[in-house]
Structures are given as structure tokens and as C-alpha cells.
Interface confidence: low
């Protein structure tokens, strides 16, 4: 009979009866016996616990007791394992991935690690980073394409581009958050002054001395004024877009009423204040008659000029 | 004190679109924080729609990914919901959320805005 | 999806007493879960989160505990404040909430 099994040298585990190593080695092919792994080691379905087997090739599995590493000895900063097991065996390879802006250390936005038999192959990396940013009517004085959290990275204005009040170089910060800004730089003659004033209006911010090309500045109309056009007006190629304007309102005082012997109809305001487009209503005054038809009673109110009725 | 404050209308009219905005105050919207919507339809629990970094970058509920589009406007410190094609299963309070990040993927909500109502109806 | 169940659906319990609110979930999510109460016509309050740190501002009669599947919610002594909607919330793998239990008065 055929003795193909010795008896069984286990590393990080054992038999659960070594006192069976007279009596039954070498094993015949066919027997199975029960072991155990230490700790931080696992049997090949996981357990900590399971059957040695003897084949005509040997002892199976041929490794009993494997490897194991832990989730909670990973440290990652600004990145995440998405597996939710907390146990891996060896040779496992686990991926992680880095939060929006950071990067491996090769520039991927995901790595992976591996359990080996000391533990897991290194820690993950996942480093702040900023790209090459896009840059217009100017240049980067570095080759770079990525940069490091807190990384300056300078640049320069092509010839007649300018970034504000004469400056022709700038530098931005990668940050937390990205790049402290864009870097762009503008047609000297693109940018604009203040934006006009308008009568009876004005602006709803403080003005500056010079806009950047596509900057907007909000208009608003004072009291009783009706503003006409947009309330934005927009910087490009160096010019304002037509700014709104604030049409009069009518104002009908009692003065021109008496002028005209005639008072408003359903009201006894001594001044009233009208928009362009609406309709006031008028009567004779007690003892005065209407010279001309009762429609002539209803004046419209245009860009602040209405034209009375009259009562003799 | 970061505060949350949703806005948008309260009533949508079934295969309409759900529009609602999420402002932001007392703190930057480009925090590294990731900025959430959930809703509660009446007289249940919660449930998670999506979430959105100040860079764009998106997360959706599997479940609701086809109709919703999370975007973010940085000018105006504040992050805004479309859910399309909205039938009666949509009603409910609909609230944002800011996640309070730590060292993990994602966190549990720490703030949240007070929520508002939004009925599907014709 | 990872389901999350909590039980039970109601929970009645003199003031005074202690709660104990549990929540399973459908596979391990670690430590990654949170607690929340949510008053009638108010939006959930965070309570706890990593299974076991409470919030800022959070009573200490508050604790959670649990790895994994299993979760507790311990409300040592309680306060008529206390009465409210529990929900657990999993951010392992997305973020999904359990269907919550009601804590009230008994």
C-alpha cells in the first residue's frame, strides 16, 4: 500500500491532535485530518479551521494556512477603500481611490495594494494635485503638469494682453480647492471704464475703475421710474452694451388740474404718479362741463407728458 | 454657521421636471464637502438621491440616476436638483444636506436644510 | 443596494427608562453608519456617526455601538425631548437610511 503522506509540517498552524503522529504517518491517500491556522493566518476557504487532505500528490491544499491583513491597517488620507470587507487573504489586491483633486503618487485617481506575506504591499497615496490649467492669451513659465498643494505656478502675458492696471505676470496657488483662479489675460483695449450713468438711475454695485472683458453691472431706476431694456449691461471688446434707460413717470398735480378745472375721477390725491402706459381718469370739477367728448376724460400717460382734458 | 436653504416650487405637474435650489450661507460651497439632496415622501422614510463636489463631480442613487441632474453654481454659493419626468411617487419634502467630512469616503450629514414641500399634481 | 432594517417598527418606553434601538444591515458597512432623530414637520438631526461618536452638541445619554451588520442605539434615561422618528443611515457603499423607528411615549 501506497504511504504518500508524511506527517504534516504546517506553518503558522497545526494539527488539532499531534499525538496522532506515530499511530498515523505517513497517511494513506484518502485521509483527512483536521487543522488549525494562527493568528493573522486563514485556511484557503477563509476559516481559521479546516481539513488537511492526502492525495496521491501529497498533502492538499498544498499551503493550509495563509496570509492575512486587516482594513484598519490602512491609513488613507483624501481617498477611500470602497470594499467593505475587513479581512483579506494573501495575495489579495484591494483598490482604493483618491477624493476629487488628489491623485496616486503616479497620477492615477485609483491604486491598488496587495497582502503580502509581512503585511500589505504599502500604504495608500493619495496626493493633492492640480492639472495644467487651461490657459488664454497667455503662457505658463513651467513644463510641469501637475502640481502639489501649494505649488506656484507663474505665468506671463502674450505681447499687448495685459492681467489688470498694467500688469503683464501673474502667479497662481494650487490649493485645497484647485487653483486660487484662472489665469487670464485680456486685449489691453477689451477691458472697460466705468459703465455710463444713465438718468434717473443707478447702479446696484460699487463701480470700478476698469472691468474685465464680459463683467456685468446691474442698473436700477429710481422711485416712479420705469426701467426700459435689460438692467445688465455687459463689458466686451471694450465697450459697455446699451444701458437701459428710466422712463419719467407722469406726475399730475393739482396745479395742472386746476389749470384745467377738472380732478381725478375715484381719487382725491393732491399728486399722483402714473407709468408710461397707464390710463388716468379725469372729471369736471362741481360747475365746470366737459367741452369735448367723455372719452377725451381718459388721458394716457407717455415717457412723463400726459395731455390734460379741459372744463369750462 | 453653515446654513442650508432650499427654494423651488411646490407643485410640479406629473412627466414635468422638478426643479429646486440649494443655498448656501455662512461658508463657501467650495468647501471640501460633498453637498447631498434627499427626500422624504409623507409619512415615510429617507431616501438618498445624489450628491455633488464643488468641482462637478457627481454621485446618484442607482435608483434615480436616469431622471436626476445635480449641478453646482459656485458664483452664487449654491447647488441645484432637476428631476425629470416626476409622477405622484415623487411627492415629498425634499431636503439638502451637507456631509461633514472626515477621513472616509463619504460622511453622515451634519447639516441639513429645512426642507420643502413639493406635491406632483395636475 | 445594502438594505437597512431596523427594529423595532415602535418602541414605547416610560420616560426615565432606557431605549435600546437596533439596525441591521444587509451586508458589512464597517463603522460607517450614523444615527439621526427626526421631529414631526423637522429635518433629521445628526446623533451619532462612525457607529459611536456622537455628534457636536449631542447629550451623553446618547451612545451607539456596533461594527459591521449589527448597530445599537442606547438612550440611557429618557427625556420627554427624546420622543421622535430614529433612522440609521449606512455610507459604506452609496448612502441608503433604514425605514426608522418611533420612539414614543409610554
Known amino acids: 500500500e501506497v504511504k504518500p503522506c508524511d506527517f504534516p509540517e504546517i506553518q503558522h498552524g497545526g494539527l488539532y491532535y499531534k499525538s496522532l503522529r506515530r499511530l498515523y504517518f505517513p497517511a494513506a491517500a484518502g485521509q483527512s485530518y483536521s487543522y488549525y491556522c494562527d493568528q493573522n493566518f486563514v485556511t484557503p476557504s477563509g476559516s481559521y479551521w479546516d481539513y488537511i487532505h492526502c492525495t496521491q500528490d501529497g498533502w492538499s491544499p498544498t499551503v493550509p494556512c495563509l496570509r492575512t491583513c486587516s482594513k484598519s491597517d490602512i491609513e488613507i488620507e483624501n481617498g477611500f477603500i470602497s470594499e467593505s470587507s475587513s479581512i483579506y487573504i494573501l495575495n489579495k489586491e484591494i483598490q482604493y481611490k483618491c477624493k476629487p483633486g488628489y491623485a496616486t503618487a503616479d497620477g492615477n485617481s485609483s491604486g491598488s495594494i496587495t497582502c503580502l506575506q509581512n503585511g500589505w504591499s504599502a500604504q495608500p497615496i493619495c496626493i493633492k494635485f492640480c492639472d495644467m490649467p487651461v490657459f488664454e492669451n497667455s503662457r505658463a513659465k513651467s513644463n510641469g503638469m501637475r502640481f502639489k498643494l501649494h505649488d506656484t505656478l507663474d505665468y506671463e502675458c502674450y505681447d499687448g494682453y495685459e492681467i489688470s492696471y498694467g500688469n503683464t505676470t501673474g502667479s497662481i496657488v494650487c490649493g485645497e480647492d484647485g487653483w486660487s483662479h484662472f489665469p487670464t489675460c485680456y486685449n489691453s483695449s477689451e477691458k472697460c471704464g466705468p459703465p455710463p450713468p444713465i438718468s434717473n438711475g443707478d447702479t446696484t454695485s460699487f463701480l470700478l475703475k476698469v472691468y474685465v472683458p464680459q463683467s456685468r453691472v446691474e442698473y436700477q431706476c429710481q422711485s416712479y421710474y420705469e426701467l426700459q431694456g435689460s438692467n445688465y449691461v455687459t463689458c466686451s471688446n471694450g465697450e459697455w452694451s446699451e444701458p437701459p434707460r428710466c422712463i419719467h413717470p407722469c406726475i399730475i398735480t393739482e396745479e395742472n388740474m386746476n389749470k384745467n378745472n377738472i380732478q381725478l375721477k375715484g381719487k382725491s390725491d393732491i399728486k399722483y404718479y402714473a407709468k408710461t402706459g397707464d390710463t388716468i381718469e379725469f372729471m369736471c370739477k362741481l360747475g365746470y362741463n366737459a367741452n369735448t367728448s367723455v372719452l377725451s376724460f381718459q388721458a394716457v400717460c407717455r415717457e412723463g407728458i400726459v395731455e390734460y382734458p379741459r372744463c369750462e | 454657521q453653515v446654513q442650508l436653504q432650499e427654494s423651488g416650487p411646490g407643485l410640479v405637474k406629473p412627466s414635468g421636471t422638478l426643479s429646486l435650489t440649494c443655498a448656501v450661507s455662512?461658508?463657501?460651497?467650495?468647501?471640501?464637502?460633498?453637498w447631498s439632496w434627499v427626500r422624504q415622501p409623507p409619512g415615510k422614510g429617507l431616501e438618498w438621491i445624489g450628491e455633488i463636489y464643488h468641482s462637478g463631480s457627481t454621485n446618484y442613487n442607482p435608483s434615480l440616476k436616469s431622471r436626476v441632474t445635480i449641478s453646482v453654481d459656485k458664483s452664487k454659493n449654491q447647488f441645484s436638483l432637476k428631476l425629470r419626468s416626476v409622477t405622484a411617487a415623487d411627492t415629498a419634502v425634499y431636503y439638502c444636506?451637507?456631509?461633514?467630512?472626515?477621513?472616509?469616503?463619504?460622511?453622515?450629514?451634519?447639516?441639513w436644510g429645512q426642507g420643502t414641500m413639493v406635491t406632483v399634481s395636475s | 443596494e445594502i438594505v437597512m432594517t431596523q427594529s423595532p417598527a415602535t418602541l414605547s418606553v416610560s420616560p426615565g427608562e432606557r431605549a435600546t434601538l437596533s439596525c441591521r444591515a444587509s451586508?458589512?458597512?464597517?463603522?460607517?453608519l450614523a444615527w439621526y432623530q427626526q421631529k414631526p414637520g423637522q429635518a433629521p438631526r445628526l446623533l451619532i456617526y462612525?457607529?459611536?461618536t456622537r455628534a457636536t452638541g449631542i447629550p451623553v445619554r446618547f451612545s451607539g455601538s456596533g461594527s459591521g451588520t449589527q448597530f445599537t442605539l442606547t438612550i440611557s434615561s429618557l427625556q420627554s425631548e427624546d420622543f421622535a422618528v430614529y433612522y440609521c443611515?449606512?455610507?459604506?457603499?452609496?448612502?441608503?437610511f433604514g425605514q426608522g423607528t418611533k420612539l414614543e411615549i409610554k
Open positions: 451586508q458589512s458597512v464597517s463603522s460607517n
Open positions: 443611515q449606512q455610507y459604506d457603499n452609496w448612502r441608503t
Open positions: 444636506a451637507r456631509d461633514q467630512l472626515s477621513s472616509g469616503p463619504t460622511d453622515a450629514f451634519d447639516i
Open positions: 462612525g457607529a459611536s
Open positions: 455662512g461658508g463657501s460651497i467650495s468647501s471640501s464637502n460633498w
